[in-house]
């Protein structure tokens, strides 16, 4: 039996910068039952304050609900760690909300197969940038990543996009079902999960329809 | 602690390339961005670009595109910077730097010289 | 890129006195966050550089209450309060509010 190990925090994650989680891993417990805190300062202050919300975001984690989250201030977190024989701490951690911005995916992704005056037929692939995002104000920039391939096949095709919330896509084999999924990052922050796939018969043969 | 291990010298031919290494312990590698910082003699500092080790997921200074190429080996919690086509304005101390999550840096290696001489 | 001008170059002091640093820079560095990402670093001989100051005026961890910053837009100063010895070596100002990322030409800080 031993005092416990250090705790790290390892991630810090926030949907839409008006919340946020940290997780940590716990390090070893000394064989004992140990409890795990989290406490935290905000810059400039010298009030210390312990974790609001342990439940929400699940087992050796810390929610910051709207109400304690801030972009203006950097957080400086501590996980402590207490057994019987003892105590440690994390290295204190430092926290911008704006750079630990990790969105939904982007949604409403749809696909469409058209057809040039050349007849070179190409799918117009189109989505909307994540419901929280308020890209229109500048409040966030995102980028974007497509990534399709046969149903059939095991890699994917990558497509970065920049800014733009479509693409086209040329040289498709005709006849083949395609996977198409977006996701999307924004500036200084976390590409989001890849998006539900959406899926596409290319055709055999394309009659240009108005 | 947190450690980043930075080797101390290479000494290489003009024209060739050469590939840093800057190995990372006392932390979870792939939780922080590594940012590449370029400090010629006597001179100021330059910052090259940084890497996300979680993904590679990288953003470059302009000046250092096709310079410089970042990558990381997550089994080694290493970060690698090469530089290619080296000259003369090549020879400087390179430093590896480990952010928060922030987008500052707090903690540094040591620097690796890089000479380029024939 | 934004650059950053340091003044002075050189700055000679005796041992317990004040100094002052000066960093502009050439456009504001307040993020579209509201935020001013201007920080101050230290590298003494033969060392790589220790962060002393982030955000204009927060002191990192373990850097003594002697030092201090201030200032917003384009106009920052790093005070030290009585120099000490340990305090010698080259100043730089940094900013990452804009990519790419810049710093100063740096201040040496020696004795008199």
């Known amino acids: 039996q031993s005092p416990p190990g250090k705790p790290e925090i390892h991630k810090c994650r926030s949907p839409d910068k008006e919340t946020f989680t940290c997780w940590w891993n716990p390090g070893t417990d000394g064989g004992l039952p140990t409890n795990y805190s989290l406490t935290y300062s905000k810059e400039g202050e010298k009030t210390t304050y312990e974790c609001p919300d342990y439940k929400t975001s699940g087992p050796n984690s810390c929610f910051f609900s709207k109400q304690y989250t801030s972009i203006w201030k950097i957080y400086i977190i501590t996980v402590n760690a207490t057994n019987q024989m003892g105590s440690s701490s994390s290295d204190p951690l430092y926290v911008d909300v704006t750079y630990i911005v990790e969105p939904e995916p982007p949604r409403n992704l749809t696909l469409e197969v058209k057809q040039l005056k050349d007849k070179k037929t190409y799918l117009w692939v189109k989505w909307s940038p994540p419901t929280i995002t308020d890209v229109k104000t500048g409040w966030f920039t995102m980028e974007y990543e497509i990534r399709l391939k046969p149903e059939e096949a095991e890699e994917w095709e990558i497509h970065f996009t920049g800014h733009q919330t479509q693409f086209k896509v040329f040289d498709l084999y005709p006849g083949q079902k395609y996977l198409v999924q977006t996701r999307c990052k924004p500036d200084h922050g976390y590409w989001s999960r890849w998006s539900q796939e959406s899926s596409v018969e290319m055709p055999n043969d394309f009659t240009l329809k108005d | 602690q947190v450690q980043l291990q930075q080797p101390g010298a290479e000494l290489v031919m003009p024209g060739t390339s050469v590939k840093l290494s800057c190995k990372a312990s006392?932390?979870?590698?792939?939780?922080?961005?590594i940012h590449w910082v370029k400090q010629r003699p006597g001179q100021g500092l330059e910052w090259i670009g940084e890497?996300?080790?979680?993904?590679?997921?990288?953003n470059y200074n302009q000046k250092f595109k096709g310079k410089a190429t970042l990558t990381v080996d997550r089994s080694s919690s290493t970060a690698y910077m090469q530089l290619s086509s080296l000259t003369s304005e090549d020879s400087a101390v390179y430093y590896c730097?480990?952010?928060?999550?922030?987008?500052?840096?707090?903690?540094w290696g040591q620097g690796t010289l890089v000479t380029v001489s024939a | 890129d934004v650059v950053m001008t340091q003044t002075p170059l050189s700055l000679p002091v005796s041992l317990g006195d004040q100094a002052s640093i000066s960093c502009r820079s050439s456009q504001s560095l307040v993020h579209s966050n509201g935020n001013t990402y201007l920080h101050w670093y230290l590298q003494k001989p033969g060392q790589s550089p220790k962060l002393l100051i982030y955000?204009?005026?927060n002191r990192f961890s373990g850097v003594p209450d002697r030092f201090s910053g201030s200032g917003s837009g384009t106009d920052f100063t790093l005070k030290i309060n009585r120099v000490e010895a340990e305090d010698l070596g080259v100043y730089f100002c940094s900013q990452s509010t804009h990519v790419p990322f810049t710093f100063g030409s740096g201040t040496k800080l020696e004795i008199k």
């Open positions: 955000k204009v005026s």
């Open positions: 890497i996300d080790p979680s993904d590679s997921y990288t």
């Open positions: 006392g932390y979870t590698f792939t939780s922080y961005w």
């Open positions: 730097g480990r952010s928060f999550f922030t987008n500052w840096f707090a903690y």
